[in-house]
Amino acid sequence: AIVFIKQPSSQDALQGRRALLRCEVEAPGPVHVYWLLDGAPVQDTERRFAQGSSLSFAAVDRLQDSGTFQCVARDDVTGEEARSANASFNIKWIEAGPVVLKHPASEAEIQPQTQVTLRCHIDGHPRPTYQWFRDGTPLSDGQSNHTVSSKERNLTLRPAGPEHSGLYSCCAHSAFGQACSSQNFTLSIADESFARVVLAPQDVVVARYEEAMFHCQFSAQPPPSLQWLFEDETPITNRSRPPHLRRATVFANGSLLLTQVRPRNAGIYRCIGQGQRGPPIILEATLHLAEIEDMPLFEPRVFTAGSEERVTCLPPKGLPEPSVWWEHAGVRLPTHGRVYQKGHELVLANIAESDAGVYTCHAANLAGQRRQDVNITVATVPSWLKKPQDSQLEEGKPGYLDCLTQATPKPTVVWYRNQMLISEDSRFEVFKNGTLRINSVEVYDGTWYRCMSSTPAGSIEAQARVQVLEKLKFTPPPQPQQCMEFDKEATVPCSATGREKPTIKWERADGSSLPEWVTDNAGTLHFARVTRDDAGNYTCIASNGPQGQIRAHVQLTVAVFITFKVEPERTTVYQGHTALLQCEAQGDPKPLIQWKGKDRILDPTKLGPRMHIFQNGSLVIHDVAPEDSGRYTCIAGNSCNIKHTEAPLYVVDKPVPEESEGPGSPPPYKMIQT
């Protein structure tokens, strides 16, 4: 059998707060637990949901949670069901509402000396207690002329008189909390001797030097007094006018006329009505001077045919708000059609080329008129004046490719070379008319060029092939001074290119023929074994039929290449002693020696007193310090070649001799002792 361990119980709950109906069952097999509310199954929601076997309420709702809850446990296998005791909530709540007129039926029926009943529509459970207020002041029960019925939530005024006029509100509180009326009631009971507004002055906007009129009327029995004041509380009468209101007239009906209005007349005007009894009634109206600012400039606009475009005219700041309209060719645009005005916008639908031109936005108010033009261009697709042509351009000279087009607006021309956009640099320049200039044509400029001419309406393109007419030139030009090693084989290359493959030959500069051991093989001068006599000036001549010939002069020097007779050795020196790094080189021409120490060339003129380079090339360093340690490089060079060799220098502290070591004991490494 199914047994309830915990059953739900009826309980107090607060509107909008959490609550839990407990249910726990024990059964021999698995059971399903579900909940009923007034006999209907409870569906889970975010607000109310099953939490295990219990029913949890995230926020109790007085409408949806009123009724009888029951926990049901079901054994699906047998079909047996057990039902808990019924449980319900005593929900405590309070809800604001308006103050309404209960009697008489309408405000129009309220007369002096009639009974007026107001009802406070704040409700709650438990029933709240009510407090009434007039103009924020509490009304205590039993006060003269009014009674409060808490049961009916009513306030009764009997009889109602002008002294009861005011704003009525109510508040209520209960165990749950407090609420005040969501909408209050203004009771207005006229007293014939109180001034009442018949005509209130309105704010006025006038142009400078125009006239302004304020109307103001009150009624009462006996008739009320009326007075006009300007901002600074100066009274305005026909007898005593303030200095800045000389042109003010107050009429018998209460209207105030101001003529030839100036900026100093702008401000707040107060019309004050005073009855025999009651408070004065003060009505305010402001006199504004009309003004209009300048309009912002329009950027020229470019549109494409067939599209729909809009141009917004931002009205200038002004008082009163300026009205805006659009004109074209002196004619105001209609509010519908193909080209029309919509609000502040100029609308051009299905744009045609003929729509191009100047459109004017006008703005006007009492202060004047402003206008601003916008130039509208209707873009056309470019057309050709001159397409780029396949061209033969001479190497080394400027080359030009035309791309002349016309369109509205002026088209933008870009050039591509081998499908890559050409960006202007020292070699390429695109003229305003679209022509491409190649400043110094090079062989690899021979390829496809494409120009594209565009406007917002579209683009056209054309391409042309450039063939470069190669100039006759050495590739590369031979070095003007070259060395050959004595008694060795040597070659001197010379090659050239041109529109036609050139013939290349060598000759001696003096015109004499080449000796038999020297051969000229397709432009390469070959010396089987260099002799001293091979030194001298030679000329390489490249020639072809259409381009003639070119010459390159080469001075050949015969040299004995450098070898080192003495090379510096790894050296260790005691601190404070002298280091000697020897270096001697031979060659023809006789080589010069330079030293490099610790990655910088040692300039003989700036060595200082500690260092010296001897005539034979050796480097001496006196009074060596640890910072002199490092690699030293001996560089030998002449006009034909350069060679280097290096050795490290170590500077060490002098050791203190130990007893066991005799004075003749050698150091553990090779030393220079001075």
Epitope: H32, L36, R74, D76, V77, G79, R83
Partner: antibody, heavy 112, light 109 residues
Framework: EVQLVQSGGGLVHPGGSLRLSCAGS????????MYWVRQAPGKTLEWVSA???????YYADSVKGRFTISRDNAKNSLYLQMNSLRAEDMAVYYC??????WGQGTLVTVSS | EIVLTQSPGTLSLSPGERATLSCRAS???????LAWYQQKPGQAPRLLIY???SRATGIPDRFSGSGSGTDFTLTISRLEPEDFAVYYC??????????FGQGTKLEIK
């Protein structure tokens, strides 16, 4: 011994009505969930409707608004009132208690 | 709504053989709430297994149920001649809106 005896089946025209009954014995009828299951010829079993011991009711979408399940605990009886019958309602209807106790079934034929 | 799919649609075996019937759910079913029925022509369904693996009263021990989540199995270890019938799986959730599989017909080979 638990017994469920059904009655009320028969032939009915489309749009017509029929009331099925199921009498329970051998158990405390009022404390059990009871339900109806049907089986169209050659088809699978289809749950139709259920009623809790407290009278809470449940219906398959296919019959909602047309069929009404009810019980009379004093008479130990379960009922299924079938209105606006359609051709697809034709089946053997079984009343059941839990999973293990079923009535003998009653045939409902809907035909014009 | 949970949909139960049984396979195979028809199973042809001989007496003495082992039968394995499958039931797959479209979403997870608590294993406590899956049942198996046997139905013979002209008779009401008969409960075999409940809670996926518990045998109903009077059901021989050759019938066994297993599985969890979405995959469940009914096994008949040695088929007897009286076991040839249609078998249905059934899901019974927290609401009494029970759903059945389409059935597996077990026939003699």
């Amino acid at each position: 011994e638990v017994q469920l005896v059904q009655s009320g089946g028969g032939l009915v025209h489309p749009g017509g009505s029929l009331r099925l009954s199921c009498a329970g014995s051998g158990f405390t009828f009022s404390t059990y969930l009871m339900y109806w299951v049907r089986q169209a010829p050659g088809k699978t079993l289809e749950w139709v409707s259920a009623i809790g011991s407290g009278g809470d009711t449940y219906y398959a979408d296919s019959v909602k608004g047309r069929f009404t399940i009810s019980r009379d605990n004093a008479k130990n009886s379960l009922y299924l009132q079938m209105n606006s019958l359609r051709a697809e309602d034709m089946a053997v209807y079984y009343c059941a208690r839990g999973l293990g106790y079923w009535g003998q079934g009653t045939l409902v034929t809907v035909s014009s | 709504e949970i949909v139960l799919t049984q396979s195979p649609g028809t199973l042809s075996l001989s007496p003495g053989e082992r039968a394995t019937l499958s039931c797959r759910a479209s979403q997870s079913v608590s294993s406590s709430y899956l049942a198996w029925y046997q139905q013979k022509p002209g008779q009401a369904p008969r409960l075999l297994i409940y809670g996926a693996s518990s045998r109903a009263t009077g059901i021989p021990d050759r019938f066994s149920g297993s599985g969890s989540g979405t995959d469940f199995t009914l096994t008949i270890s040695r088929l007897e001649p009286e076991d040839f019938a249609v078998y249905y799986c059934q899901q019974y959730g927290s609401s009494p809106m029970y759903t059945f599989g389409q059935g597996t017909k077990l026939e003699i080979k």
